[in-house]
Interface confidence: medium
Amino acid sequence: MMTGTIETTGNISAEKGGSIILQCHLSSTTAQVTQVNWEQQDQLLAICNADLGWHISPSFKDRVAPGPGLGLTLQSLTVNDTGEYFCIYHTYPDGTYTGRIFLEVLESSVAEHGARFQIP
């Protein structure tokens, strides 16, 4: 029986050309986090391994920055970045916890600036 829960930023929006922080937090468990994967649909964006540190997928290294913490910063956003993002926490002994974030990248200043974790 797994006890933990993932809190995420939920649905967020940002302007084209801007940046956004994707953030998840694992709570209500003492399980040890061994790795966090960040994925967009079926594409791996980045890995933060407890022992080996960060690895950014080569195809995203120009637009993805590690952190803050176990989060991920997306830069130079395009409309094509709109979609679902997943944080996958690999823990021991519980296994995997997955959180979902939906990002909408807007063409102009109609982005909701009140979204949490957004970089101005």
């Epitope: 061994t34 391994n49 823990t91 002994p93």
Partner: antibody, heavy 121, light 111 residues
């Protein structure tokens, strides 16, 4: 070397609680999780649950929430599996198995010889 | 819970030939780094013995005729060349989540 010692057999009357033991030696006892696995004759393995040997934190298979209680005695390096209100369905071989953590991917690297539990009046 | 489907349920292989056992999981048990899949051998009256960890890594002391591969949901255990002492039941097991689950087993007979 690592050893997990279990009694070979236990006989219990239906409805009477039973406590199975697993004594560990040959390694740093409190650094691991200990698992319990049930195997009925001619059948596969059913994972019951696991207990951390330093802080007694447990994870249980939901199918065993009302059946199994896991405890640990650090002073004797022994873990226990208590089965409540046993019936003939609980007659099986019960193994303890140490779980080794490898970058979060864990596996059972050492097993006890198993205790054959017979529930009979 | 993750369902582990092993096939075949039983297998008869001639001495020196290849034995192939399949294990399929109801969801992926792999990350980009590891597969949380392990293989055990069990003989009558004995506890299971770890053969392969993390889909393809041979446990220390296990003969090199045992090998395994796979990722995601499809995994395979191979024994080649099969020896008489390999007669046993083989099980796959995942450690992707709680609860851990096992395959139903494949009984290998040598002729």
């Amino acid at each position: 070397q690592v050893q997990l010692q279990q009694p070979g057999a236990e006989l219990v009357r239906p409805g009477a609680s039973v406590k199975l033991s697993c004594k560990a030696s040959g390694y740093s006892f409190t650094s691991y999780w200990m698992n319990w696995v049930k195997q009925r004759p001619g059948q596969g393995h059913e994972w019951i649950g696991m207990i951390h040997l330093s802080n007694s934190e447990t994870r249980l298979n939901q199918n065993f929430l009302d059946k199994a209680t896991l405890t640990v005695d650090k002073s004797s390096s022994t873990v226990y599996l208590q089965l409540s209100s046993p019936t003939s369905e609980d007659s099986a071989v019960y193994y303890c198995a140490r779980e080794r953590d490898y970058y979060g991917s864990s596996y059972f690297d050492y097993w006890g010889q198993g205790t054959t539990l017979t529930v009979s009046s | 819970d993750i369902v582990m489907t092993q096939s075949p349920a039983s297998l008869v292989v001639s001495l020196g030939q290849r034995a192939t056992i399949s294990c399929r999981t109801s969801q992926s048990v792999s990350t980009s780094s590891y597969s949380y899949m392990h293989w055990y051998q069990q003989k009558p009256g004995q506890p299971p013995k770890l053969l392969i960890k993390n889909a393809s890594n041979l446990e220390s002391g296990v003969p090199a005729r045992f090998s395994a591969s796979g990722s995601g949901t499809d995994f395979t255990l191979n024994i080649h060349p099969v020896e008489e002492e390999d007669a046993a039941t083989y099980y796959c097991q995942h450690s992707w989540e709680i609860p851990r689950t096992f395959g139903g087993g494949t009984k290998l007979e040598i002729k």
